[in-house]
Every structure is written in C-alpha cells, then in structure tokens.
Amino acid sequence: EVEKTACPSGKKAREIDESLIFYKKWELEACVDAALLATQMDRVNAIPFTYEQLDVLKHKLDELYPQGYPESVIQHLGYLFLKMSPEDIRKWNVTSLETLKALLEVNKGHEMSPQVATLIDRFVKGRGQLDKDTLDTLTAFYPGYLCSLSPEELSSVPPSSIWAVRPQDLDTCDPRQLDVLYPKARLAFQNMNGSEYFVKIQSFLGGAPTEDLKALSQQNVSMDLATFMKLRTDAVLPLTVAEVQKLLGPHVEGLKAEERHRPVRDWILRQRQDDLDTLGLGLQGGIPNGYLVLDLSMQEALS
C-alpha cells in the first residue's frame, strides 16, 4: 500500500506521458488523478511501467470503479490486465470482441491463466452462445480451448461456428466432447461433396455412430489409422471386415500394427477368423469357424 503524501510542486500530472515512468510509487499515487488515468488508458500501455508502478495505477482505478471497470478502460489495460485477479474480472461486463482480442494479446504465447479463463467465461456468458467470430478468436489464441469446455458448454456452440475449428483444436478432446461436436459438424458440412466432406469431418469422427461409419465406408474415403484409432469402440464393433476394409482403403495394412490396441483389438474379437483371414494381414483372435455368437444384450432388450 502506497503511503498518501502530497504531490510535490510542479509534479501534478496534466496528462499520461512518458515522464511518469520516472515517478516514484508515492508520487504516482499523489500526482496522478484517477479520472485522468481512466480517460487516457490508451497511453498507459505505451509506457513501459514496472509492475510495481502498475500496482499503484490499478489501485487508483479500483478506487474510481469499485463496482468494476467500464469497457472503455478494460480495452486499454494492456499489461495492467496481468495484475487483475479473477475476482476483479468477474465484476466486468465485456461485450466487444475487440476488447477480448486486446486482452488475449497481452497473454499471447502463454498458457491460459485463471484471469483469461474468467474473462472468456464472462464474455461467452454475456453473448449467450459461442458464435463463430468468438470461437475463431479463442482458438487462434488457445488451440486447445474447445476441448477445455464441458459437453454442456459445448452444446451452446452453433453448427455455423464449427467452420472455425481446425484439426489441432480437437487434439485434446475426449469422446464425450466429440459426441457433442460431431452432430454439429455433420450439420455444418452436410452440403459438401464426398471427398471435401471427409476432409472437414475427419477430426470430429471420434463422435460418429456406427451408421455414419458404414456410410463413409461406401465413399472410398481411405481413412488413416490415426483417425480410425480415435473412433468410438462401440461404433467400430458392429462394422464388418468388408466395411473396415473399404473404410481404410490402402491403410487397412496398418491394422496389424494396432491389433493389440483398442478399438482394433475389440473389433477383431467380434469378427469371424475366416473373414479376418481374407485381409491377408495375419490378424489373430477372431471367432473360430463353427462357433455361434449370441448377442445377449440384444436378447435382454427383446425380453
């Protein structure tokens, strides 16, 4: 806390300029008017104040705006944003995407801080949904942003926003998240032709049901093994050997290297060994000839 002292003669700030950087902390407190600071916030970020000095300026703004800063001030916080606590940010009402971008720029290249997470939360809640422009902005700064949201939060993403999503944005998504995103992607890309559609939908396929995988197998898509390995096990199990062969195309040979890993391992256990042998890959573990497979889950459903 800076001790309150009278401003020395001739040192009263008439405007926010570079001379203030050479003021001691107590001089900043005594000689800079909070209202002047608020109206000239755009100049503050152009002056490389130390964080100690920024503490003093923050204190002045906190006194002027105890209920939270107006957006005109927030937009120009610059490095001062790094001094804000999540509690400070919860008092804000940020509606402009330009303000959001300006603050994210300050934190660019670093992991998402609690301050940034709070800011984004306030912004998205204020907008009511995660629209395309917001998603574009957030994934540009934080590629993993989408996968940090809960399935409930993802449900507010309109299908039109899916166009902003890049494959790397989904790298850390789990199946529950992809279950929510896949139907939106399917809707967003529904008017594209076969090969273009597959390129766009590929990263979302971890949420695809069996019937969609069956449909894709009829389109010569040549799915790579990395994508296949991310598919839902329950969606892969009902696929026939012929369907998997069509789905993977030339990549089918990669099944051998993955035969001990899910979903390939579980899928092999469900196939007839005769059918697996037709692939010529030496896959082992299928159902021996002459054995009858009873689907007990289906039987329970019928009774």
Epitope: L54, Y79, G109
Partner: nanobody, 117 residues
Framework: EVQLVESGGGLVQAGGSLRLSCVAS????????MYWHRQAPGNERELVAY???????NVADSVKGRFTISRDNSKNTLYLQMNSLRAEDTAVYYC???????????WGQGTLVTVSG
C-alpha cells in the same frame, strides 16, 4: 522465472566512467523491458533508465547526457554506461526486468558504485 546478476560496480573518481552489466538467465524470451534503478544510502530507490524489447530507451533527467542504457539481446545482457560521474551518483545500482508471462518485476542483487571526491 528470470535471474539477474549485476557487475561492473566499484570505486571511481569524480568525473570518471564505469560500465555496469546485468546478465539475465532463465526464461529470457519472456523479457519485455529492462531497467536500471539506484538507491543511495538513506534514500528511496529511483529509476535511472530503461530499454524496451523494441529498443526504445530513456534516462532520468538527473543523468541525461551522462548515462546511456543499452541491451544486447543475443547475450541477454543489459548495460549502463556512466560517464562524468558525480558524488551524488554513489548508490547501489539494481537491474530489473518486466516479463510478459508473470506480473512481478524480477530483480538482481545490486552492484555498489562509489564516486569519491
């Protein structure tokens, strides 16, 4: 995060020169602005000069025309060239940095400059 070590201080005659150095280590890629401060016995610390990552620099009025600040990013080193030294320049000189990643100033231990007579 960032460690700073100053050197180059010592005893010098009034009118003489010294060159202070400050070497930064650690997460130096996050350094934005680098500063020289000083604290004379019985006085509070004051900012002497700064230089930003873009090369913009400035010095306090009390040392203008006598002190020059510079920075060599390839060596992660900050310099303060002090000419025409006066008795009132006697102080412990500290280097500090502002980074883009963490909202605190990082400080060195300081180097003592004594100007006699």
């Amino acid at each position: 995060e960032v460690q700073l070590v100053e050197s180059g201080g010592g005893l010098v005659q009034a009118g003489g020169s010294l060159r202070l150095s400050c070497v930064a280590s650690g997460r130096t890629s996050t350094i934005d602005t680098m500063y020289w401060h000083r604290q004379a016995p019985g006085n509070e610390r004051e900012l002497v000069a700064y230089v930003t990552s873009r090369g913009t620099s400035n010095v306090a009025d009390s040392v203008k025309g006598r002190f020059t600040i510079s920075r060599d990013n390839s060596k992660n080193t900050l310099y303060l060239q002090m000419n025409s030294l006066r008795a009132e320049d006697t102080a412990v000189y500290y280097c500090s940095v502002r980074t883009t990643s963490y909202p605190v100033d990082f400080w060195g231990q300081g180097t003592l400059v004594t100007v006699s007579g």
